[in-house]
């Protein structure tokens, strides 16, 4: 079974998008990853964690180039989500240098709710997206990005913070989720897996992608992050899945080519400003949206998540560079830095397009199972 690439979704046609023949099932990243020895039981095995909120960050978008993928999430095959029993957990460890338990990590003890009680909240991120259950919401208009095409100077800080690689963004990157829903981009970071093991945070019908980018934004209603944490809509994250394609992605290469310089935890370097929107899919009109949390402690809720339907394509070499260059705490590779998916607990994911409509000949009358709740709010 292949993941169809739809030619009409490819903005420039050609390049790494527009493939008509589907990928074989064997090409899909396995959800049944074998556990690492050091990994504790799955999150779902930890008491009181089934409601944990998640965290994440990353904003910005613009029309994509030939390097961007045209895979649409609604075209993915249905896969039973196995529950991620062997995936990295919401766990923290006691720092070597003291009692402080705030130095959390992926995999280890104690569980994240002990680090931050909010991590045991009911509306956490990431989640599994099931397009058939998404509520089509025509009021969700195309995202608007302004000022994302940065000049080379001033340079930007690229840091290995031990959990991810983070690019700090300058003032002036404006993003609107809709009328009156305006944000400023703060930073972007990535989540990835390891060799042969996908590492996106969100999943689609149980399918985990190789990697995921998050652009984190702060609502213009707040001056600073500390004021916005936990407030509904205070933070917004734009998320996009990264997939393997046949060509090198030149936008990502501007960052990936510098990772060796920051291989050590805590290292940072300065990189020339770049077109941040080139790191995102080109189709700003088709996306999923829901309210969740940060995917790392303190797991503050109220975060508006926007997950693009279109994916971004990187070469196999680039994905390998991403997952195999950086080092994290305790002389361990910085890999598999994703949180397990969290229960929706009654939340309905909204879609800006009719993702759940079955247009196949079998369906005499397409049915959308959920309706849009936020009619223009």
């Amino acid at each position: 079974q292949r993941l169809p690439r739809m030619q009409e979704d490819s903005p420039l046609g050609g390049g790494s998008s527009g493939e008509d023949d589907p990928l074989g099932e064997e090409d899909l990243p396995s959800e049944e990853d074998s556990p690492r020895e050091e990994d504790p039981p799955g999150e779902e095995d930890l008491p009181g964690e089934e409601d944990l909120p998640g965290e994440e960050d990353l904003p910005e978008v613009k029309p994509k180039s030939e390097e961007e993928g045209s895979l649409k999430l609604e075209d993915l095959p249905t896969v039973e989500a196995p529950g991620d029993p062997q995936e990295p957990q919401n766990n923290a460890h006691r720092d070597k240098e003291g009692d402080d338990q705030s130095h959390w990590r992926y995999g280890g003890d104690p569980p994240w709710p002990r680090v931050s009680p909010a991590c045991a909240g009911r509306f956490q991120s990431p989640v599994d997206i099931r397009p058939q259950l998404a509520a089509f919401c025509p009021a969700l208009r195309p995202l608007e990005l302004l000022g994302f095409q940065l000049p080379p100077l001033p340079e930007l800080r690229l840091r290995n913070n031990g959990h991810s690689v983070q690019l700090t963004l300058p003032p002036g990157l404006e993003m609107a989720l809709g009328p009156g829903r305006e944000y400023r981009a703060l930073q972007l970071h990535l989540h990835w897996g390891a060799a042969g093991r996908p590492g996106s945070e969100h999943t689609v019908e149980g399918h985990r992608f190789p990697a995921e980018i998050h652009v984190v934004h702060l609502s213009t209603a707040f001056a600073r992050v500390d004021e916005a944490l936990g407030r509904p809509g205070g933070l917004a994250v734009l998320a996009a899945f990264l997939e393997e394609g046949p060509e090198e992605n030149s936008a990502y290469e501007q960052l990936l080519s510098r990772l060796e310089e920051i291989a050590e935890e805590g290292s940072e370097t300065q990189v020339p400003g770049l077109d941040i929107s080139a790191l995102l899919p080109s189709d700003f009109s088709r996306y999923f949206q829901y309210e969740g949390s940060l995917t790392t402690p303190p797991c503050a809720q109220g975060v508006i998540w926007t997950v693009f339907n279109q994916t971004v394509m990187l070469s196999a070499k680039q994905l390998h560079t991403l997952s195999d260059t950086l080092w994290g705490p305790g002389d361990s590779r910085l890999q598999l830095n994703f949180r397990a998916t969290q229960p929706l607990n009654g939340r309905v994911i909204e879609a800006s397009f009719p993702a759940g409509v079955d247009s196949s000949p079998r369906a005499a009358e397409p049915v959308q199972l959920n309706s849009c709740l936020a009619a223009g709010d």
């Epitope: 840091r159 031990g162 600073r224 500390d226 805590g266 303190p298």
Partner: nanobody
């Protein structure tokens, strides 16, 4: 809102020691313990450079020029960042800034360190 205030700077002779402190106030409890914290410095006519950092994952990293002489530490209970500076050299003269990085950067106003005989 979070505010950072450095203290401990001053004039010291080469070979001497200073201990810089940075206190976070305001809503810092919301973010401090989950942030990467760092000290940067800026000498006249030069770019701001990283001196030392403790990442949100707990690792420490020092610039080559201060390794073995400076020690960074944090006290999450008191929301403070410390920089113990030993064997100071004239080239350590700069304005020192503390930084808290949690989704966005928070900066102090800086404290002057002058190493001179």
């Amino acid at each position: 809102q979070v505010q950072l205030q450095e203290s401990g700077g001053g004039l010291v002779q080469p070979g001497g020691s200073l201990r810089l402190s940075c206190a976070a106030s305001g809503n810092s409890a919301n973010i401090f313990s989950f942030a990467s914290v760092a000290w940067y410095r800026q000498a006249p006519g030069k770019q701001r450079e990283l001196v030392a950092v403790i990442t949100s994952a707990g690792g420490t990293k020092y610039s080559d020029s201060v390794k073995g002489r400076f020690t960074i530490s944090r006290d999450n209970a008191k929301n403070t960042i410390l920089l113990q500076m030993n064997s100071l050299k004239p080239e350590d003269t700069a304005v020192y800034y503390c930084n808290v990085d949690y989704l966005q950067d928070y900066w102090g106003q800086g404290t002057q360190v002058t190493v001179s005989s």
